[in-house]
Amino acid sequence: SNQPPGGGGGSGGDCPGGKGKSINCSELNVRESDVRVCDESSCKYGGVCKEDGDGLKCACQFQCHTNYIPVCGSNGDTYQNECFLRRAACKHQKEITVIARGPCYSDNGSGSGEGEEEGSGAEVHRKHSKCGPCKYKAECDEDAENVGCVCNIDCSGYSFNPVCASDGSSYNNPCFVREASCIKQEQIDIRHLGHCTDTDDTSLLGKKDDGLQYRPDVKDASDQREDVYIGNHMPCPENLNGYCIHGKCEFIYSTQKASCRCESGYTGQHCEKTDFSILYVVPSRQKLTHV
């Protein structure tokens, strides 16, 4: 049959409709929306009203798989997969539809939160225009003689801070990685601080086709787990591979957030800072952020 079977694993929003019989929905993690009164009109998008002490709360019961199959939502946010988009729609009780497969090209500067921004589906578009998709901070110069993607990235103001990139090359500063990625219109990620060495296996450094070691900024990307680790740290889900550059990634069940336990000599949210550096690097397919 052409249609996928019902109830493939976890709960991609099938539970509330009664379709996902493969797991007990009541045992799933509950993500509460901000709705105070719960009824059919206020608890939509796969939410179910659940008793909570005195009253009812809208619960979003989604056990999302973490396969990286990005979709662009009508609010302009990129989601790790369609399940995360549905979960965000439920959590915020706001319609979010898939407008395109793949990441949203337009960069609204958002981080890895859960998509609080308002957005009209009509206003969201992927940057195609005459140039085709211009990615990695490139802009479409439609007035130029040879129409194409133009990179206006100025790295002259950055100090010497060498990094090794996924193309096997050393760059004098992460800004130059971003510039190269923009010029070549292909994914180039930072693998580590410092020049590339002989021990860096270029076959593992992730050429253009190496399968996205780092993901673009995605909304609602925390992985809800069925395992009971309440109050404990647990290993990060596989979708956060590479989240900690020089350290160990730990997932805090109670907050559904990832944190890094840094190796000696490194600090920062992603263990990306050295004692002598103010460099802040967020490896991403789409951008590099400097603070």
């Epitope: 493939g8 694993g9 973490t66």
Partner: antibody, heavy 121, light 107 residues
Framework: QVQLVESGGGVVQPGRSLRLSCAAS????????MHWVRQAPGKGLEWVAV????????FYVDSVKGRFIISRDNSKNTLYLQMNSLRAEDTAVYYC??????????????WGQGTLVTVSS | DIQMTQSPSSLSASVGDRVTITCRAS??????LAWYQQKPGKVPKLLIY???TLQSGVPSRFSGSGSGTDFTLTISSLQPEDVATYYC?????????FGQGTKVEIK
């Protein structure tokens, strides 16, 4: 009915390249992620790679990263596996398989019959 | 990467016996687990997905259970046609790793 037909297998020397194809029919190709799975003679199944829907999201098993490239041509309903720098341990029957992943995720409901790749000097 | 470990690697049982195969994931995978049957010289066939959901056309003597890290495939009454190698597979995220397989034979 759903059909997946692999081709391109054969005998090849170590270090050389080979390109496998998988022709799909009987379903909406763009609605499925397409995978390669291999099985060395007398051994178990090993997942090799996946390419999702539009073709930009791809993942590989560590042992083939940097050597194999998975791709798809949605206009031709065809999946490819470009295998470079082949090694003796790549000798296996290579299967293509389809899987749906969206709001929910499902494993392989259809497989091809497989094509044998032998890497030998 | 998450490892999938199957046990036993092989077993021999009589027709009519209840057979149990286990699969353990090195980290929790919710219920994103599938079981396949592969008969000698044949292509693998999906038996169970979502840990416990029987694929269409699969005999009801096959059942699956478990969630998180520990999973079980049970054949309630072994039949001669069940001689095969059985594989578990995780599919919550790449890589979609298989277990090493369990070979089932008739005594």
């Amino acid at each position: 009915q759903v059909q997946l037909v692999e081709s391109g297998g054969g005998v090849v020397q170590p270090g050389r390249s080979l390109r496998l194809s998988c022709a799909a029919s009987g379903f909406t190709f763009t609605s499925y992620g397409m995978h390669w799975v291999r099985q060395a003679p007398g051994k178990g199944l090993e997942w090799v790679a996946v390419v999702w829907y539009e073709g930009s999201s791809k993942f590989y098993v560590d042992s083939v990263k940097g050597r194999f490239i998975i791709s798809r041509d949605n206009s031709k309903n065809t999946l490819y596996l470009q295998m470079n720098s082949l090694r003796a341990e790549d000798t296996a029957v290579y299967y293509c398989a389809r899987a749906y992943c969206g709001g929910d995720c499902y494993p392989f409901d259809y497989w091809g019959q497989g094509t044998l790749v032998t890497v030998s000097s | 990467d998450i490892q999938m470990t199957q046990s036993p690697s092989s077993l021999s049982a009589s027709v009519g016996d209840r057979v149990t195969i286990t699969c353990r994931a090195s980290q929790g995978i919710s219920n994103y687990l599938a079981w396949y049957q592969q008969k000698p010289g044949k292509v693998p066939k999906l038996l169970i997905y979502a840990a416990s959901t029987l694929q269409s056309g699969v005999p009801s003597r096959f059942s699956g259970s478990g969630s998180g890290t520990d999973f079980t495939l049970t054949i309630s009454s072994l039949q001669p046609e069940d001689v095969a190698t059985y594989y578990c597979q995780k599919y919550n995220s790449a890589p979609w790793t298989f277990g090493q397989g369990t070979k089932v034979e008739i005594k």
